[in-house]
Interface confidence: low
């Protein structure tokens, strides 16, 4: 069974940093592209970033480009999101999601999410 | 970025009735050489992560009941629930994965008409 478990969320001040992790199990991690999607309280879904199965290609939403870095460690089956220069508008539940193949496509499996709160 | 516009924002349908949600993309998401539309639909219930319902515009996700169907091509797409059940109450989002950044519609809330 596919399992995705996010961690690393919490309360941080504007300008601060956080590193989210997503531990994956139940599938061959390196064979799938992975994405981060966020959802602000009471709002819709926003795609944040994606990474190909090998880690060779990374993609970002304009709103996080230059501040967030997606990466993966295929030997540990773990996905990461390094978030720097955090802003109040980054407050959201961050979901880690597995796509249907090794390039960026639809996401068929999602974690339960980890809450990031940016506030002074 | 490709802009996704869903309609309506919410709809109330009686149990057993048909529910139809529309999604319009600001540019075509049909990749002609593959004859595939790079569009997916997700269902999200309160307090839960989204669940993939439809991908490639018309392919049902794993374990999705056959009362759910997707149709459309190019820029106009529809998600249909042929006979609404109580467990279908949720917010539904369309998403394009034709180009990065991937983008979602604003969501359509489906409720039961009392």
């Amino acid at each position: 069974e596919v399992q995705l478990l996010e961690s690393g969320g919490g309360l941080v001040q504007p300008g601060g940093s956080l590193r989210l992790s997503c531990a994956a199990s139940g599938f061959t991690f390196s064979g799938y592209a992975m994405t981060w999607v966020r959802q602000a309280p009471g709002k819709g879904l926003k795609w944040v970033s994606g990474i190909s199965g090998s880690g060779g290609s990374t993609y970002y939403a304009a709103s996080v480009k230059g501040r967030f870095t997606i990466s993966r460690d295929n030997s540990k089956s773990t996905l990461y999101l390094q978030m720097n220069s955090l802003r109040a508008e980054d407050t959201a539940v961050y979901y880690c999601a597995k796509t249907i193949n090794d390039i960026l496509t639809a996401t068929e499996d999602w974690g339960q999410g980890t809450l990031v709160t940016v506030s002074s | 970025d490709i802009v996704m516009t869903q309609s309506p924002d919410s709809l109330a349908v009686s149990l057993g009735e048909r529910a139809t949600i529309n999604c319009k993309t600001s540019q075509s998401v049909l990749y002609s050489s593959k004859k595939k539309n790079y569009l997916a639909w997700y269902q999200q219930k309160p307090g839960q992560p989204p669940k993939l319902v439809i991908y490639w515009a018309s392919t049902r996700g794993s374990g999705v009941p056959d009362r759910f169907s997707g149709s459309g091509s190019g820029t106009d797409f529809t998600l249909t629930i042929s006979s609404l059940q109580a467990e279908d109450v949720a917010v539904y989002y369309c998403q394009q994965y034709y180009s990065t950044p991937q983008t979602f519609g604003q969501g359509t809330k489906v409720e039961i008409k009392r």
């Epitope: 064979g31 090998s54 060779g56 290609s57 480009k65 390039i103 | 593959k34 950044p101």
Partner: antibody
């Protein structure tokens, strides 16, 4: 050291066929999407096709769709292929094999389509 | 498909001079790649995801831009920089290249 070596190019008549190969070494071939890119005699670059790391998903330029087929052999010999049918004079080019993100290219193989 | 228009097609610069070439995009994309090609050799990735220098690329090179407008800049031209530079988008299939900017030394 990452290496990509193309072969299989040559002179072929319009309507003919060729199969290009690209042998990869120095990296885990099965972990990377791979592409074919060509460069015309006028030096114009054109992305031709891409295949996902597992070989399941393929993508083509509209100019070659239905005529060219990209494939790969991850199991035996870490080789990328491009099967080219119904060749036209405008397919004349140097064909390069490239690794995902096109950071690594081979030296290319020349395909000439002429009567 | 997305059309990339590079300008100028050909340019020349003196050693030490600042050089800027542009790549205009027919519809907004997320990032741009740049390649350098010298005669008789295959193209080489030079700048990736708009502003990141590929391995071994001198710091006098920089890339910038967003949406529909991207550029490659050389802060001080050197003889070895003479080459043809191509932009490429990988945001949307089919991936496309610009027609190239040929940079010559004065």
């Amino acid at each position: 050291e990452v290496q990509l070596v193309e072969s299989g190019g040559g002179l072929v008549k319009p309507g003919g066929s060729l199969k290009l190969s690209c042998t990869a070494s120095g990296f885990t071939f099965s972990s990377y999407a791979m592409s074919w890119v060509r460069q015309s005699p006028e030096k114009r670059l054109e992305w031709v096709a891409e295949i996902s790391s597992g070989g399941i998903h393929t993508y083509y330029s509209d100019t070659v769709t239905g005529r060219f087929s990209i494939s790969r052999d991850n199991a035996k010999n870490s080789t990328l292929y491009l099967e080219m049918n119904s060749l036209r004079s405008e397919d004349t080019a140097i064909y390069y094999c490239a690794r995902e993100t096109t950071g690594t290219w081979g030296q290319g193989t020349l395909v000439t389509v002429s009567a | 498909q997305i059309v990339l228009t590079q300008s100028p097609a050909i340019m020349s610069a003196s050693p030490g001079e600042k050089v800027t070439m542009t790549c205009s995009v027919s519809s907004s994309i997320t990032y741009m790649h740049w390649f350098r090609q010298k005669p008789g050799t295959s193209p080489k990735l030079w700048i990736y995801t708009t502003s990141n220098l590929a391995s071994g690329v001198p710091a006098r090179f920089s890339g910038s831009g967003s949406g529909t407008s991207y550029s490659l800049t050389i802060s001080r031209m050197e003889a070895e920089d003479a080459a043809t530079y191509y932009c490429q988008q990988r945001s949307r299939y089919p991936f496309t290249f610009g027609s190239g900017t040929k940079l010559e030394i004065k």
